[in-house]
């Protein structure tokens, strides 16, 4: 007996071939001997089966001696043995229909779980193997679960169902809802405008929800809400914003915030949360602000940084085109009695400059100029 595997919702063609290459009489029946369809000359005749409106054949193949049974919009319950009667012969085909569905929404938040459920006909014993977009394989029986979804799990999951040495492949598109970056850091000189961007790692037709940016300034004892906003069909509207700092927010995606001035009192880290409509849980992105200030007070040239810096970052003061006068893994460095000229304060990581501030030291009778 020939075995054919089908996918729920798909179309399947069960073949039946006569030895004569011409149109002759044929009939398709199910295991209960109920007639599904057959021919009478050029015409199709249909029986009282439950397949009536979904069963068909292909007239253009009859003259080739091929009399297929085509079943559209397959259902699990179409799984059966189908018998083709042609030329006093009987051809049996066993059809097994499988379905694979994500038992929750296919749009899941980062960190959530994905469960795939296999629908299979009674008496079948299939095995399932799924391959994630990042190449991770998972195996199981009727259900497969993946916990702690990551951004790289977004994309097409390919699942293969094996039964009777035959296989059928399912493709399920999973969208992991997350920000493109879990964390970002912005380095700014004091007084500069600060741009914070929170690009999403997914695109959907309509995006509705609400969000908030909480900020923990390095100098402050507790965090405070800087801004709250709504998102409706990808349009952003600000609900509430603090007076200090007075943040501005872009009206379109990606989420974009502007801090008019980088000041030491704003240096610190923030957490932007986004709650999406009809989703449990929130999306998070951490953002950090490091602010640099270079000053000269009397005979002391000082460079300071505020905000979350890693211990391996190096802060240096150097006269332009000369070796660093001072270089420390600290948040403040200074030079006493600096020579006249253009001094550079540099914050660097393994030789790569992250932030630079220049200050002009004038001969001792003048006051310093900050370019």
């Amino acid at each position: 007996k020939k075995v054919v595997l089908g996918k729920k919702g798909d179309t399947v063609e069960l073949t039946c071939t006569a030895s004569q290459k011409k149109s002759i009489q044929f009939h398709w029946k199910n295991s209960n001997q109920i007639k599904i369809l057959g021919n009478q000359g050029s015409f199709l005749t249909k029986g009282p089966s439950k397949l009536n409106d979904r069963a068909d054949s292909r007239r253009s193949l009859w003259d080739q001696g091929n009399f297929p049974l085509i079943i559209k919009n397959l259902k699990i319950e179409d799984s059966d043995t189908y018998i083709c009667e042609v030329e006093d012969q009987k051809e049996e085909v066993q059809l097994l229909v499988f379905g694979l569905t994500a038992n929750s929404d296919t749009h899941l938040l980062q960190g959530q779980s994905l469960t795939l459920t296999l629908e299979s006909p009674p008496g079948s014993s299939p095995s399932v193997q799924c391959r994630s977009p990042r190449g991770k394989n998972i195996q199981g029986g009727k259900t497969l679960s993946v916990s702690q979804l990551e951004l790289q799990d977004s994309g097409t999951w390919t699942c293969t169902v094996l039964q009777n040495q035959k296989k059928v492949e399912f493709k399920i598109d999973i969208v992991v809802l997350a920000f493109q970056k879990a964390s970002s850091i912005v380095y700014k000189k004091e007084g500069e405008q600060v741009e914070f961007s929170f690009p999403l790692a997914f695109t959907v037709e309509k995006l509705t929800g609400s969000g908030e940016l909480w900020w923990q300034a390095e100098r402050a004892s507790s965090s405070k809400s800087w801004i709250t906003f709504d998102l409706k069909n990808k349009e952003v509207s600000v609900k509430r914003v603090t007076q200090d700092p007075k943040l501005q927010m872009g009206k379109k995606l990606p989420l974009h915030l502007t801090l008019p001035q980088a000041l030491p009192q704003y240096a610190g880290s923030g957490n932007l949360t986004l709650a999406l409509e009809a989703k449990t849980g929130k999306l998070h992105q951490e953002v950090n602000l490091v602010v640099m200030r270079a000053t000269q007070l009397q005979k002391n040239l000082t460079c300071e940084v505020w905000g979350p810096t890693s211990p391996k970052l190096m802060l240096s003061l150097k006269l332009e085109n000369k070796e660093a006068k001072v270089s420390k893994r600290e948040k403040a460095v200074w030079v006493l009695n600096p020579e006249a000229g253009m001094w550079q304060c540099l914050l660097s990581d393994s030789g790569q400059v992250l932030l630079e501030s220049n200050i002009k030291v004038l001969p001792t009778w003048s006051t310093p100029v900050q370019p």
């Epitope: 996918k7 919702g9 798909d10 179309t11 399947v12 063609e13 073949t15 021919n39 050029s42 015409f43 199709l44 249909k46 009536n52 409106d53 068909d56 054949s57 292909r58 007239r59 253009s60 193949l61 009859w62 003259d63 080739q64 091929n66 297929p68 085509i70 559209k72």
Partner: antibody, heavy 126, light 107 residues
Framework: EVQLLESGGGLVQPGGSLRLSCAAS????????TSWVRQAPGKGLEWVAV????????YYADSVKGRFTISRDNSKNTLYLQMNSLRAEDTAVYYC???????????????????WGQGTTVTVSS | DIQMTQSPSSLSASVGDRVTITCRAS??????LNWYQQKPGKAPKLLIY???SLHSGVPSRFSGSGSGTDFTLTISSLQPEDFATYYC?????????FGGGTKVEIK
């Protein structure tokens, strides 16, 4: 948007080979028989080959039998036409076309080409 | 193989005219007949399937009739966008075959 997009055409010498591809999008590719139809310059339409849903059944026009092979990769939503031993008379625009089955309760569904690609030009010349 | 013969091979008509194109099959094909429209440099478009059923999106000025061996495509009132070549095609038997085409030109 439901569409078919052919590629792979070009200039080839008689006796040479060419492989055409047709990328399907916007519909369940595996639920349709798919054909190649060609049109020689200034001439009418000529059906070339057809392939069944899963690729197990293939039928060809006598003019290409034994030289052309139709195949499909449902996982990639792509139809192919491998053309070998090309002749000058194979010069044409090659279209891939989706077949839709228009059924009724009393007759076998009529198959018609409801979606066509934009065509890819094959020129066989020395 | 089933031969499909279209007539006329070309015709000249004016906007607003009623146009009739015929297609004859070399053997009975019941109603396994489709009609297509093709404009220069473009792919064909399905107009009518199963001899008389209008494909979705096709204007109602197009109609088809016939059964067995003789079929007709009628354009009740020719519009400027209807100047094109029209093909019939049978899906009764493999190989699938097309008629030679009828070119409808502006008079």
């Amino acid at each position: 948007e439901v569409q078919l997009l052919e590629s792979g055409g070009g200039l080839v010498q008689p006796g040479g080979s060419l492989r055409l591809s047709c990328a399907a999008s916007g519909f369940t590719f595996s639920n349709h028989y798919t054909s190649w139809v060609r049109q020689a310059p200034g001439k009418g339409l000529e059906w070339v080959a057809v392939i069944s849903y899963d690729g197990s059944n293939k039928y060809y026009a006598d003019s290409v039998k034994g030289r052309f092979t139709i195949s499909r990769d449902n996982s990639k939503n792509t139809l192919y036409l491998q053309m070998n031993s090309l002749r000058a008379e194979d010069t044409a625009v090659y279209y891939c076309a989706r077949e839709e089955k228009y059924s009724s309760s009393w007759y076998v569904g009529v198959d018609a080409f409801d979606i066509w690609g934009q065509g890819t030009t094959v020129t066989v010349s020395s | 193989d089933i031969q499909m013969t279209q007539s006329p091979s070309s015709l000249s008509a004016s906007v607003g005219d009623r146009v009739t194109i015929t297609c004859r099959a070399s053997q009975s094909i019941s109603t396994y007949l489709n009609w297509y429209q093709q404009k220069p440099g473009k792919a064909p478009k399905l107009l009518i399937y199963a001899a008389s059923s209008l494909h979705s999106g096709v204007p109602s000025r197009f109609s088809g009739s016939g059964s067995g061996t003789d079929f007709t495509l009628t354009i009740s009132s020719l519009q400027p966008e209807d100047f094109a070549t029209y093909y019939c095609q049978q899906s009764y038997s493999t190989p699938l075959t097309f008629g030679g085409g009828t070119k409808v030109e502006i008079k």
